[in-house]
C-alpha cells in the first residue's frame, strides 16, 4: 500500500467508486463471473481479484472508472502483503496457540457457518 | 466436515480440548512455529494449518489430546470446503459486484488495518 | 507463442494522414488491452493510449488525443493507430505492447515497431 | 502527469562489473515500476515490473528495488550482452510515463 493514501481511506474511495460506477459495469449482460456461495470473504479474496480481472477487461476505460481499477489493484497488493505476513515469525508454542485459539474464536462467534 | 456433529459444535469442542491440554502443548520449549503478525485469521488458514502439522508431529499422542488433532483435521476439511464454494458458481456482474461491496465494506469494518 | 506483428515502415507526406497495424497471435486477443508507444529518433519513449478490444473502449495520453484515434478488428485480431494532419514531429518509431495483467500496467509483449517518416 | 528521472543518461562498464541505475519519480507510485532493455534496432524488452519482480526467462543477474519515489535497477556482474539502452516506466497512473533512459556501454 503506497504510503499517500492508508489503506483504510482506499477501501472507503473505492467503495465510493464502485457505487459511483455500478451502472457502467452492469452494462455487460452476457458476462457470468464466479461469486462465493459463502460471506467468508477473506477465505475467496483469489477468486475476487480474478472476478476483477474479468470485469476490467470487459469494461470500457477512462476517468474515474479506471482509477476503481487501480485502487482494486492497490487493495488486491495490500491483501498479498497481508498474506507474506501470516509466516514471517517464528515464536514459541504458547504464542501459536493463543494465535490458534485466537482463531478458533473468531470462527465460533463471527463466521457464516451454515448448519448441516 | 462429516454430518455427525455441526461444524460449529465442532468448534466449540476444539477451543475446550485446546484449553485442556495447552499444558502438554507447551511442553517443548524449543519448538518454533511460524504466527502470524496479524488478527486477519482467515488469509493465513494454510500457516495456521502447518502450524498445527508441525505441532502434531511434536505432541505424544494418546487420550483426548488425539481428539483434538482429529477435530483441527476436520477444521481444515471444512475450511478447504469453503475455499471451494469460492468460485463454484458463476453469476451476473450485478451479483458479482453485491460480493465485492460486502468484501469492501467488511474490509472497512472488520479487518484490522494497521495505520501507515 | 505470443506474437505482434506490426505493418511495414510508412513514408506520409505532410497533412495527410497514416494507419498502422498491429496483429496479434499466440493468445486470445480480447484477454488483453494493446498500448501504443512512440519513440522519436533517439529519444525516449512516450506513452500514446491504449484500446480495449474487448469493450472498444479506449484512453489517450492528452498530448495525442487530437492526433491519434486507436481502434481494433476482433475478427482478425489486429488492433490500428491512426495518425491524422501529420507533421514533421510525427517521424518516429511506433510501437503496440501488450499490457501483462488487469492489475500491472506494463507491457510484457511488443511488436517490431513501425517507423513512420514525415517528407514532402 | 508523473515524471520519472532516471539518472545516469550513461554509463560504461568493465565485464563482471555492478552496475546501478536510478528513477526518482515525481510522487509515490507505490511499487508500480518496470525496467526494460531495449538493444540496437530492437523493440523494448521487458526485465523487471512491480519494482523487484523478475519477468520470466530474464536472468538472475537483473533485479530491482525500490519504494516510495526512489527505484533502483542493478545488474550484478555485467555481460557483454547488456551493452543496450535501459529505461523506468512507471504504471501507476495515465499516462504511464517512462525514463529518458540510460546507454550502457562496456568499457
Known amino acids: 500500500i503506497p504510503t499517500e493514501i492508508p489503506a483504510s481511506a482506499l477501501v472507503k474511495e473505492t467503495l465510493a467508486l464502485l457505487s459511483t460506477h455500478r451502472t457502467l459495469l452492469i452494462a455487460n449482460e452476457t458476462l457470468r463471473i464466479p461469486v462465493p456461495v459463502h460471506k467468508n470473504h477473506q477465505l475467496c479474496t483469489e477468486e475476487i481479484f480474478q472476478g476483477i480481472g474479468t470485469l476490467e477487461s470487459q469494461t470500457v476505460q477512462g476517468g474515474t472508472v479506471e482509477r476503481l481499477f487501480k485502487n482494486l489493484s492497490l487493495i488486491k497488493k495490500y491483501i498479498g502483503g497481508q498474506k507474506k505476513k501470516c509466516g514471517e515469525e517464528r515464536r514459541r508454542v504458547n504464542q501459536f496457540l493463543d494465535y490458534l485459539q485466537e482463531f478458533l474464536g473468531v470462527m465460533n462467534t463471527e463466521w457464516i457457518i451454515e448448519s448441516h | 466436515i462429516p454430518t455427525e456433529i455441526p461444524a460449529s459444535a465442532l468448534v466449540k469442542e476444539t477451543l475446550a480440548l485446546l484449553s485442556t491440554h495447552r499444558t502438554l502443548l507447551i511442553a517443548n520449549e524449543t519448538l518454533r512455529i511460524p504466527v502470524p503478525v496479524h488478527k486477519n485469521h482467515q488469509l493465513c488458514t494454510e500457516e495456521i494449518f502447518q502450524g498445527i502439522g508441525t505441532l502434531e508431529s511434536q505432541t505424544v499422542q494418546g487420550g483426548t489430546v488425539e481428539r483434538l488433532f482429529k477435530n483441527l483435521s476436520l477444521i481444515k476439511k471444512y475450511i478447504g470446503g469453503q475455499k471451494k464454494k469460492c468460485g463454484e458458481e458463476r453469476r451476473r456482474v450485478n451479483q458479482f459486484l453485491d460480493y465485492l461491496q460486502e468484501f469492501l465494506g467488511v474490509m472497512n469494518t472488520e479487518w484490522i488495518i494497521e495505520s501507515h | 507463442q505470443v506474437k505482434l506483428l506490426q505493418s511495414g515502415a510508412a513514408l506520409v507526406k505532410p497533412g495527410d494522414s497514416v494507419k498502422m497495424s498491429c496483429k496479434a497471435s499466440?493468445?486470445?486477443?480480447?484477454?488483453?488491452?494493446i498500448h501504443w508507444v512512440k519513440q522519436s529518433h533517439g529519444k525516449s519513449l512516450e506513452w500514446i493510449g491504449y484500446f480495449n478490444p474487448n469493450s472498444g473502449g479506449s484512453n489517450y495520453n492528452e498530448n495525442f488525443k487530437r492526433k491519434a484515434t486507436l481502434t481494433a478488428d476482433k475478427s482478425s485480431s489486429t488492433a490500428y493507430l491512426e495518425f491524422s494532419r501529420v507533421t514533421s514531429e510525427d517521424s518516429a518509431i511506433y510501437y503496440c505492447g501488450r499490457r501483462i495483467a488487469w492489475d500491472h500496467w506494463y507491457f510484457d509483449f511488443w511488436g517490431p515497431g513501425t517507423m513512420v517518416t514525415v517528407s514532402s | 502527469d508523473i515524471q520519472m528521472t532516471q539518472s545516469p543518461a550513461s554509463l560504461s562498464a568493465s565485464l563482471g562489473e555492478t552496475v546501478s541505475i536510478e528513477c526518482l519519480a515525481s510522487?509515490?507510485?507505490?511499487?508500480?515500476v518496470a525496467w526494460y532493455q531495449q538493444k540496437s534496432g530492437r523493440s523494448p524488452q521487458l526485465l523487471v515490473y512491480a519494482a523487484s519482480r523478475l519477468q520470466d526467462g530474464v536472468p538472475s543477474r537483473f533485479s530491482g528495488s525500490g519504494s516510495g519515489t526512489r527505484y533502483f535497477f542493478k545488474i550484478s556482474g555485467m555481460q557483454p550482452e547488456d551493452e543496450a539502452d535501459y529505461f523506468c516506466q512507471q504504471g501507476y497512473k495515465t499516462p504511464l510515463t517512462f525514463g529518458s533512459g540510460t546507454k550502457l556501454e562496456i568499457k
Open positions: 510522487e509515490g507510485i507505490s511499487n508500480d
Open positions: 499466440g493468445y486470445t486477443f480480447t484477454d488483453y488491452i
